[in-house]
């Protein structure tokens, strides 16, 4: 696959994946109630992470949103933080990923640049589908825990005990929004990695280490910035190289390409 | 105006089959649940089936599920009761319920049709 | 099922007068989602078939005259009539229309002293 297609392929994918993030971050079928082996209920109740809903009979929907942040679960809080961070970082990938498409020319961006743009947005969409995939889990893993500890009393209070009036337990189980948010963390992590590995092969081989050349009394010198260590021209691992008097030129001028041992 | 009209009641003997049937107007049938709730003679109230608007919910009584079975045709805004088995504790008035938007309510109700099982 | 208890079976009481009847429920009607009670009360006149008074436990039906109000919560509901009328004659009944299947009280009878 050419590298235009991969980034441009990972770029769609973590869209498209973060486009599912905020949907299901903002859908409120997170938690529904479970009709199996229950009291049949004359209301469908189902929550998000924002309100709560009631479906009547009817049809008739009637949603309430949580007007509180101290009385909520830590970890309802925790989610909420996790997609949040998630929609954000996707954003940010977003902005950067577009400068960085090999398809769209913005000023005099050489590749460089752009690879490490890529490999930038990469890794937010990567983060940022990890995010949406714990903050998903964490909420199922609550559900879950829940819907045991309902199970096991599914009737608070002892009915007929003492005379103690029995309360409907309602009982929540897996709502579509977790499968959306599965799957959109799940194409975002996937894009990312597409975006990372579409940044390999925009990197030219050289592109990281432009070696400047510069004429030294008698011997021919290759200073190097980043590696500060200088090689004579007579190493095995050397090659001739045009020196020009009173100027340096980097080794792109004249298209050599270092092997992997050039430079340590 | 809402109007609900039942018919199809009548004597039966124990053991026999009835077919009600309530004829809906004054409101778009296909977007409403109803009701069948019964009166025995001098007695209280008695819910005894629903079916959604898209028939995907049908709930009964316990005392007449195997029995009694409801239906609807919203092309036709018909609604119907088909009830086997008839024993003497179903003779009542039965009646057609629309049920409201808000609150699971009913909150309009036929003349209802007298249904009479004796031998 | 939810078994539905009214009291007093029947009350007789001067026109003009305050009166309240009651209904208890076997099980909680309150449901958390959306702070509700599934109850709802009917009046049903000699003759007629009955007729939706009051849902939500307290909100009146349109039409239906201010003096009659629903209050309660959870299992334990009441209806009020504040200045009885002589067209409040009648069988008022309440019902649970929050688990399948909706049951009924046995109804209160209100008559006229």
């Known amino acids: 696959m050419s590298v235009t297609a991969c980034q441009g392929l990972g770029f769609v994918v973590s869209l498209i994946g973060f486009a599912g993030i905020i949907a299901a971050t903002c859908m409120d079928q997170w938690s529904t109630q479970d009709l199996y082996n229950n009291p049949v209920t004359a209301v469908f109740n189902y929550q998000g992470l924002w309100r709560s809903c009631v479906r009547e009979s009817s049809g008739f929907t009637e949603c309430r949103g949580y007007f509180t942040l101290l009385g909520l679960p830590a970890m309802l809080q925790a989610v909420r933080a996790l997609m949040i961070v998630g929609i954000v970082l996707g954003v940010i990938g977003i902005l950067v990923s577009i400068f960085a498409l090999k398809c769209i020319r913005i000023g005099s961006m050489d590749d460089s640049a752009k690879a490490k743009m890529t490999l930038t947005s990469g890794i937010l969409f990567i983060i940022s589908g990890i995010c949406a995939i714990i903050g998903v889990s964490v909420f199922a893993n609550m559900l879950v825990t829940n819907f045991w500890m309902s199970t096991a009393n599914m009737y608070s209070g002892m009915g007929g005990m003492g005379g103690m009036v029995q309360t409907v337990q309602t009982r929540y189980t897996f709502g579509a929004a977790l499968f959306v948010g599965w799957v959109a963390g799940g194409l975002t992590l996937i894009g990312g990695v597409m975006m990372c590995i579409a940044c390999r092969g925009l990197t030219p081989d050289d592109s990281n280490f432009k070696a400047v050349s510069y004429h030294a009394s008698g011997q021919n010198v290759a200073y190097r910035p980043g590696g500060f260590k200088a090689s004579t021209g007579f190493g095995s691992n050397t090659r001739n190289k045009k020196i020009y008097d009173g100027g340096a030129r980097t080794e792109d001028d004249e298209q050599s390409h270092p092997t992997k041992y050039d430079y340590v | 105006e809402v109007q609900l009209v039942e018919s199809g009641g009548g004597l039966v003997q124990p053991g026999g089959s009835l077919r009600l049937s309530c004829a809906v107007s004054?409101?778009?049938?296909?977007?409403?649940?109803m009701h069948w709730v019964r009166q025995a003679p001098g007695k209280g109230l008695e819910w005894v089936a629903y079916?959604?608007?898209?028939?995907?919910?049908?709930y009964y009584a316990d005392s007449v599920k195997g029995r009694f079975t409801v239906s609807r045709d919203n092309a036709k805004n018909s609604l119907y009761l088909q009830m086997n088995s008839l024993r003497a504790e179903d003779t009542a008035v039965y009646y057609c319920?629309?049920?409201?938007?808000?609150?699971?309510?009913?909150?309009?109700w036929g003349q209802g049709t007298l249904v009479t099982v004796s031998s | 099922d939810i078994v539905m208890t009214q009291s007093p079976d029947s009350l007789a009481v001067s026109l003009g007068e305050r009166v309240t009847m009651n209904c208890k429920s076997s099980?909680?009607?309150?449901?958390?989602?959306?702070?509700?009670?599934?109850l709802t009360w009917y009046q049903q006149k000699p003759g007629q078939p009955p007729k939706l008074l009051i849902y939500?436990?307290?909100t009146r039906e349109s039409g239906v005259p201010d003096r009659f109000s629903g209050s309660g919560s959870g299992t334990d509901f009441t209806l009020t009539i504040s200045s009885v009328q002589a067209e409040d004659v009648a069988v008022y009944y309440c019902?649970?229309?929050?688990?399948?299947?909706?049951?009924f009280g046995q109804g209160t009878k209100l008559e006229i002293k």
């Open positions: 004054g409101f778009t049938f296909s977007s409403f649940g």
């Open positions: 319920v629309r049920s409201g938007y808000y609150g699971n309510s009913l909150d309009y």
């Open positions: 099980q909680s009607l309150f449901n958390s989602g959306n702070q509700r009670n599934y």
């Open positions: 079916i959604s608007s898209g028939t995907t919910n049908i």
């Open positions: 019902q649970n229309v929050y688990i399948y299947p909706l049951t």
């Open positions: 939500w436990a307290s």
